[in-house]
Interface confidence: low
């Protein structure tokens, strides 16, 4: 299944040779990503990232998804994507609409994870998963 409606080709992984990201954060395309080793609900994950001066990851390009999939091993990680039931659509936490494919959809699964499959997976917001936080590189 096509995960994104449109694929933006031509992005390449940028490696960090300076101190652009804090320790234990991963650098990619001028952004820093933190992959937690603990779990919590989606709301707690959002607060966890906020406490680190970041947000849950907005995985809005195929390249970004591939980069994160390559480093998530096979764990499930919450990302900043939630289902707005009244609109019947998925939105990123920056309020932009996600028109791609989310698998495992269920009326009780209003949050999304990546990392255990090659797709975005709907998940219960109340089950504890790891989380991916994202912020600007310095």
């Amino acid at each position: 299944p096509q995960i994104f409606n449109k694929s933006n080709d031509g992005f390449t992984t940028t490696r960090s040779y300076g101190t652009v990201c804090p320790k234990d954060w991963e650098f990619y395309q001028a952004r820093c990503f933190f992959l937690s080793t603990s779990e919590s609900s989606w709301n707690e994950s959002r607060d966890f990232c906020k406490g680190k001066g970041s947000t849950l990851a907005i995985v809005n390009t195929p390249e970004k998804l591939k980069f994160l999939q390559d480093i998530t091993d096979a764990e499930k990680y919450f990302i900043g994507l939630i289902y707005h039931r009244e609109e019947k659509r998925w939105r990123w936490i920056n309020n932009s609409v996600f028109n791609g494919n989310v698998t495992n959809q269920n009326q009780n699964f209003n949050c999304a994870t990546i990392g255990l499959t090659k797709t975005f997976d709907a998940a219960s917001c109340d089950i504890s998963y790891r989380r991916i936080c994202e912020k600007n590189a310095k």
């Epitope: 080793t37 603990s38 091993d73 096979a74 764990e75 495992n104 699964f109 255990l116 998940a123 790891r130």
Partner: antibody, heavy 124, light 112 residues
Framework: EQQLVESGGGLVKPGGSLRLSCAAS?????????MCWVRQAPGKCLEWIGC????????YYASWAKGRFTISKDSAKNSVYLQMNSLRAEDTAVYFC????????????????WGPGTLVTVSS | DIQMTQSPSSLSASVGDRVTITCQAS????????LAWFQQKPGKPPKLLIY???TLASGVPSRFSGSGSGTDFTLTISSLQPEDVATYYC????????????FGCGTKVEIK
């Protein structure tokens, strides 16, 4: 006391099917991240079959088990199941149910609770 | 699938000896060194000894220790005791992308 108890083993003819059950007690079944099945042929190695994420029902399997073996759950009964189809003589083994409390948390990987096992014999 | 190779397949040592068992993965286990060690006695299910390479499971004596990373791991019994007679298994975790877990074929430990 936390425990897992397997049942449903026995003698089955080649080509037959069997459904094993694993009943959990003494702990909150819904909060254990994964329930897994592992088997051991007489005098042989442990062999991983597959796991089920109790939280959302996601399953994954060893490549050799895909298609023939299916793991499912019944949260109301605090149980997980292993459906085995097209059984062969080489499937003869003790089948263990095991809990992996969290693959994703700080506890890391490790089957911390095992059932005593149930013997499956495939023979004509 | 990932494959775990243990060595030796069996060993005999004296009480008080230091015993080392190695486990080699065919490919790197995940970035959190998700490798576990189990002890199994005849007729019993395996018992978790060590998880995430070096963390001792609850109630496991401190004479057991684990180390390693990537593809090479070690279980050490610093001073072998009679109750340690058993078969020891390693298990590596790669997750759903690569067909999950795999166990080594065991190392049988006996007393001389």
């Amino acid at each position: 006391e936390q425990q897992l108890v397997e049942s449903g083993g026995g003698l089955v003819k080649p080509g037959g099917s069997l459904r094993l059950s694993c009943a959990a007690s003494g702990f909150s079944f819904s909060r254990s991240s994964y329930m897994c099945w592992v088997r051991q042929a007489p005098g042989k190695c442990l062999e991983w079959i597959g796991c089920l994420s109790v939280g959302d029902g996601h399953t994954y399997y060893a490549s050799w088990a895909k298609g023939r073996f299916t793991i499912s759950k019944d949260s109301a009964k605090n149980s997980v199941y292993l459906q085995m189809n097209s059984l062969r003589a080489e499937d003869t083994a003790v089948y263990f149910c095991a809990r992996a409390p969290s693959y994703s948390g700080d506890g890391g990987h490790g089957y911390d609770l095992w059932g005593p096992g149930t013997l499956v014999t495939v023979s004509s | 699938d990932i494959q775990m190779t243990q060595s030796p397949s069996s060993l005999s040592a004296s009480v008080g000896d230091r015993v080392t068992i190695t486990c080699q993965a065919s490919e790197s286990v995940d970035r959190n060194n998700r490798l576990a060690w189990f002890q199994q006695k005849p007729g019993k299910p395996p018992k978790l000894l060590i998880y995430t390479t070096s963390t001792l499971a609850s109630g496991v004596p401190s004479r057991f220790s684990g180390s390693g990373s990537g593809t090479d791991f070690t279980l050490t019994i610093s001073s072998l005791q009679p109750e340690d007679v058993a078969t020891y298994y390693c298990a590596g975790y790669r997750g759903a992308h690569t067909d999950g877990d795999a166990f080594g074929c065991g190392t049988k430990v006996e007393i001389k």
